[in-house]
């Protein structure tokens, strides 16, 4: 068919015969090689392989190979080798981003803040703040906010509301009387009304971009209450009516129960800015790590709404 | 009792400028991303702006890009949205919200843009 | 038009049940968290689900949230008469890096 075989016609180059001084029409040569001999009036032009360290992308006419970039600095890596067709091409590794001409690492998000878009090889992570019924409980540059284990479904209580920085943590209740059983829906250990468990005190870092106006914004991770609580994956609390108990109170002869692990890649929902999106203009300096300071109220928080 | 308080609303010409004003009261303002949402007549939601409780970050919609400012000011417990180059497609109820959640809402303020 | 379609209206006779989709893409409820919000008559919307099925205090049981892959349902069951109102989902879209919001769906008791 007409069309295959134009797709299959070599492009031509036009040189200039230096004994004869004649114009020539001669074939290129594939991309991967170059033009060792050009043609004459009796013969083909001659094509040879580009030499090691050097590559040509596309059909050509040209004398030489062209040279290959330079071996990747450190920290980068290749992305793609020097080869005959290929120049070589320089990436930063897994966990850094490019920056002024290296490679920089992944903002981690601190407790209270989770991953809204995910970093790449020549973009930082984003980190937006947890929101309401969601919490992230340990520095990371690739894990979202999760959604507070919802210690009714399994027909647990909630003996410690979570907060942006902490899941929930359930229990079970002595067993009551019939006349004294709860309702479902009703909370056993609760908040006033007023009070959204984000608003609880806790220690929390400020990633990059997320600057507070305080003066040391940074915090050191508290250790957790319970340490054998691990992180949940299902839903708030707040589903059912809290009472007016203070936020600090706990029922007597509760017994808290072992959550299983579960996903850890949960995304939130934000609606307004950080319904899912986080932190925006960045210092240039991203962090490394979390930095120790004084322990503060949590961050803000975004319009959230990201999930897994 | 968290309340937010929305003020600033009125009628403008088209290529006029507004700034609205959202007064928050009933918990730390300073904790919390704020958002944006407006209203047309008889439509639906639609996401404006947010901010991070710093101030760190801002998010634009699309349609307002380069022509609304978020800010906020903690110390004043205030959320503002500069309004600029205003268009009769702006015109709209503007709510203000807290939380990546939205889960408060103010009463809203109408912006009306006509000549 | 709307990353995430509703239907525009739904009714049902008081204490029926009423279901509302809210259908999306992977970018947005497939990989986020889906919201709900009621918007009375002449009111700002109330947040009524968050977290794709959780309730914040004072929503009544009777409203449900659920989610399965790219689309989310809010149900109402005993409709009321006070249910009467609009009814918006909204989520994050990770493709458009904004908050999204469905068309929104006028429930109406009959």
């Known amino acids: 068919q007409p069309e295959q075989k134009a797709s299959n016609l070599i492009g031509t180059y036009r040189h200039v015969d230096r004994a004869t001084g004649q114009v020539l029409t001669c074939d290129k040569c594939p991309a991967g090689t170059y033009v060792s001999e050009h043609c004459t009036n009796t013969s083909l032009r001659v094509c040879s392989s580009c030499p090691v360290g050097t590559f040509t992308r596309h059909e050509n006419g040209i004398e030489k190979c062209h040279d290959c970039s330079q071996p990747c600095p450190w920290p980068m890596i290749e992305k793609l080798p020097c080869a005959a067709l290929t120049d070589r091409e320089c990436t930063c590794p897994p966990g850094m981003f490019q920056s002024n001409a290296t490679c920089a690492p992944h903002t981690v998000c601190p407790v209270g803040w989770g991953v809204r878009k995910k970093g790449t090889e020549t973009e930082d992570v984003r980190c937006k703040q947890c929101a309401r019924g969601t919490f992230s409980d340990v520095p990371s540059s690739v894990m979202k906010c999760k959604a507070y284990t919802d210690c009714l479904s399994q027909n647990l209580v909630v003996i410690k509301p979570g907060t942006k920085e902490a899941d929930n943590v359930c229990g079970t209740l002595p067993s009551f009387s019939s006349s004294t059983s709860p309702s479902p829906g009703t909370a056993i250990f609760s908040r006033p009304e007023h009070m959204d468990s984000h608003e609880v005190p806790s220690s929390t870092y400020v990633p990059k971009g997320m600057n507070s106006t305080e003066s040391n914004s940074s915090a050191s991770v508290r250790p957790k209450v319970l340490s054998s609580i691990q992180e949940g994956t299902v839903p708030d609390n707040t589903s059912s009516a809290r009472g007016k108990e203070d936020v600090n109170k706990t029922l007597p002869n509760l017994q808290v129960v072992n959550h299983q692990q579960g996903p850890h890649h949960r995304h939130i929902l934000k609606l307004l800015p950080s319904m899912e999106a986080t932190g925006g203009e960045k210092s240039s300096t991203p962090i490394k790590g979390p930095k120790r300071g004084h322990p503060r109220q949590n961050l803000h928080k975004h319009f959230d709404i990201n999930e897994h | 009792e968290v309340q937010l308080l929305e003020s600033g609303g009125g009628l403008v010409q088209p290529g006029g400028s507004l700034r609205l004003s959202c007064a928050a009261s009933?918990?730390?303002?300073?904790?919390?991303?704020m958002s944006w949402v407006r209203q047309a007549p008889g439509k639906g939601l639609e996401w404006v702006s947010s901010?991070?409780?710093?101030?760190?970050?801002?998010l634009y919609a699309d349609s307002v890009k380069g022509r609304f400012t978020i800010s906020r000011d903690n110390s004043k417990n205030t959320l503002y949205l500069q309004m600029n180059s205003l268009r009769a497609e702006d015109t709209a109820v503007y709510y203000c919200?807290?939380?990546?959640?939205?889960?408060?809402w103010g009463q809203g303020t109408l912006v009306t843009v006509s000549s | 038009q709307s990353e995430l379609t509703q239907p525009p209206s739904a009714s049902g006779t008081p204490g029926q049940w009423v279901t509302i989709s809210c259908s999306g893409s992977t970018s947005n409820i497939g990989n986020n968290y889906v919201y709900w919000y009621q918007q009375l008559p002449g009111t700002a919307p109330k947040l009524l689900i968050y977290t794709n099925n959780q309730r914040p205090s004072g929503v009544p049981d009777r409203f449900s949230g659920s989610k399965s892959g790219t689309s989310a349902s809010l149900a109402i069951s005993g409709l009321r008469s006070e249910d009467e109102a609009d009814y918006y989902c909204a989520t994050w879209d990770d493709s458009l890096y904004a908050p999204v919001f469905g068309g929104g769906t006028k429930v109406t008791v009959l």
């Open positions: 009933g918990f730390t303002f300073s904790n919390y991303e």
């Open positions: 919200a807290r939380d990546g959640a939205a889960d408060y």
């Open positions: 901010i991070y409780s710093s101030g760190g970050e801002t």
